[in-house]
Amino acid sequence: QRLPRMQEDSPLGGGSSGEDDPLGEEDLPSEEDSPREEDPPGEEDLPGEEDLPGEEDLPEVKPKSEEEGSLKLEDLPTVEAPGDPQEPQNNAHRDKEGDDQSHWRYGGDPPWPRVSPACAGRFQSPVDIRPQLAAFCPALRPLELLGFQLPPLPELRLRNNGHSVQLTLPPGLEMALGPGREYRALQLHLHWGAAGRPGSEHTVEGHRFPAEIHVVHLSTAFARVDEALGRPGGLAVLAAFLEEGPEENSAYEQLLSRLEEIAEEGSETQVPGLDISALLPSDFSRYFQYEGSLTTPPCAQGVIWTVFNQTVMLSAKQLHTLSDTLWGPGDSRLQLNFRATQPLNGRVIEASFPAGVDSSPRAAEPVQLNSCLAAGD
């Protein structure tokens, strides 16, 4: 079912509960909220990105099949190596690749820049989104998704890779950020917190949401993920915040109901195909966009992030299932799997709608401090 969301006219950050007051201190990230992964910005992009796959397990895409008409992906784990022993896919189906970067975790050692130098880059993700500072860009048209409503067969690979739960997507899911900006979906995964502790990666004016979904895409200009890593626009991620609502989300339940089967790190199951678009907000026209990086090693930059203004609602029970079912490395619960927000370092976040205009009665004058960088597109 499509979920209700915050008021259509108010930018993210006010929550869908309709609160008027600005976010309080409790909404700001704290030491406990964010994993202790320190990711100091580096002077400049560092080499080595191409060697490491990331964003949980980036699917490594194989060349397009003439018969299938689409890529075959795999999970590249940047954390695990794709086949324990080896494995690449649609290869977005590989969850264990890149042993070189398979040894990382949230919080503690090793520091991510040691795992992948790109993690010390200047244009990293996630970031804090401040709608008032976003540049309204009318050229940002509604996102176009094609082929996201999957039939039940073939089944899809749902895996606990030790850092997230990842659903590998089959060939044929096409997404366009705009004319000539076409992508193919590879995989989706989630980030979450723990009981009473939110776990989204991006924040809005310091507010962290309970969870966040990422749908990772490869530009049609590239046949493989490793070719696209670090290239501007080579990868694109659609991100949406998940928050608590009164009703069960039937689309998410198709995945959440299977988490017990993959509670153990490295375990996986097959789940029926489903409507992937139903996992996203219904409003594809209002979003924030910026260029950043993968949020896990190898932290490759050049990733186009599109963060929906509308949120997705899950029931309290569903959010609890998400944060309290899976296990990660070393007999520890898989929780708080989000990276701390990274400095913008001069980047301007664009908005497809006038997010800087506060629609509440208290706003006397619209505020829009940045102008659209893509005005001529």
Partner: antibody, heavy 116, light 109 residues
Framework: QVTLKESGGGVVQPGTSLRLSCAAS????????MTWVRQAPGKGLEWVGL????????HYTDSVKGRFTISRDNAKNSLYLQMNTLRADDTAVYYC?????????WGQGTLVTVSS | LPVLTQPPSVSVAPGQTARITCGGN??????VHWYQQKPGQAPVLVIY???DRPSGIPERFSGSNSGNTATLTISRVEAGDEADYYC????????????FGGGTKLTVL
């Protein structure tokens, strides 16, 4: 542990019908697609067909289309293969297996012999 | 009908490495799965998604897939590895969906 057990095989004459069953246990049957695979004596594996988790979608190999029907009863954790108008070249061991894209668990098979 | 071509037989001495190939047009763009079948027994999944091993399968079994050939590699072959091996793909471009190779008989000398 996951267990699949086929039954219903036997010797039948060409043109007749037979219904195979597959009893599943050790997992939530209603969560998974199920597949039938057969193997003629001394030959390789041949995919027969499959059914989605809820029974809404079925696919068959060309040689059995219109003659074989796959169904399931999730309440009984059971999978079925209704075989009509049997031919001599349908003689094989029939396996039920869990999964669609790949088959992670298999039954021990049941032999169907079509002979006059 | 998509065709997956396997050599009918492969022979190897104990302790050596056996490589069983599965050829198909642009098979590297598909996920390949491998099954082992011993006489009188049901098939057993030994490799899935090109190179993943199910729990309980020895690390000696590995797989790769690119271009027009997928390969099942069995290192340090043991007598107990003697069996028939089948590759399999899902092919959504045809009505056949699940396609098996013809099988390869591995003989341990």
């Amino acid at each position: 542990q996951v267990t699949l057990k086929e039954s219903g095989g036997g010797v039948v004459q060409p043109g007749t019908s037979l219904r195979l069953s597959c009893a599943a246990s050790g997992f939530t049957f209603s969560n998974y697609a199920m597949t039938w695979v057969r193997q003629a004596p001394g030959k390789g594996l041949e995919w027969v067909g499959l059914i989605s988790y809820d029974g809404s979608v079925t696919h068959y190999t060309d040689s059995v289309k219109g003659r074989f029907t796959i169904s399931r009863d999730n309440a009984k954790n059971s999978l079925y293969l209704q075989m009509n108008t049997l031919r001599a070249d349908d003689t094989a061991v029939y396996y039920c297996a869990r999964g669609s894209g790949y088959q992670e668990h298999w039954g021990q098979g049941t032999l169907v012999t079509v002979s006059s | 009908l998509p065709v997956l071509t396997q050599p009918p037989s492969v022979s190897v001495a104990p302790g050596q490495t056996a490589r069983i190939t599965c050829g198909g047009n642009n098979i590297g763009s598909k996920s390949v799965h491998w099954y082992q079948q011993k006489p009188g027994q049901a098939p057993v999944l030994v490799i899935y998604y090109d190179s993943d091993r199910p729990s309980g399968i020895p690390e000696r079994f590995s797989g790769s897939n690119s271009g027009n050939t997928a390969t099942l590699t069995i290192s340090r072959v043991e007598a107990g590895d003697e069996a028939d091996y089948y590759c399999q793909v899902w092919d959504s471009s045809s009505d056949h969906h699940v396609v098996f190779g013809g099988g390869t008989k591995l003989t341990v000398l």
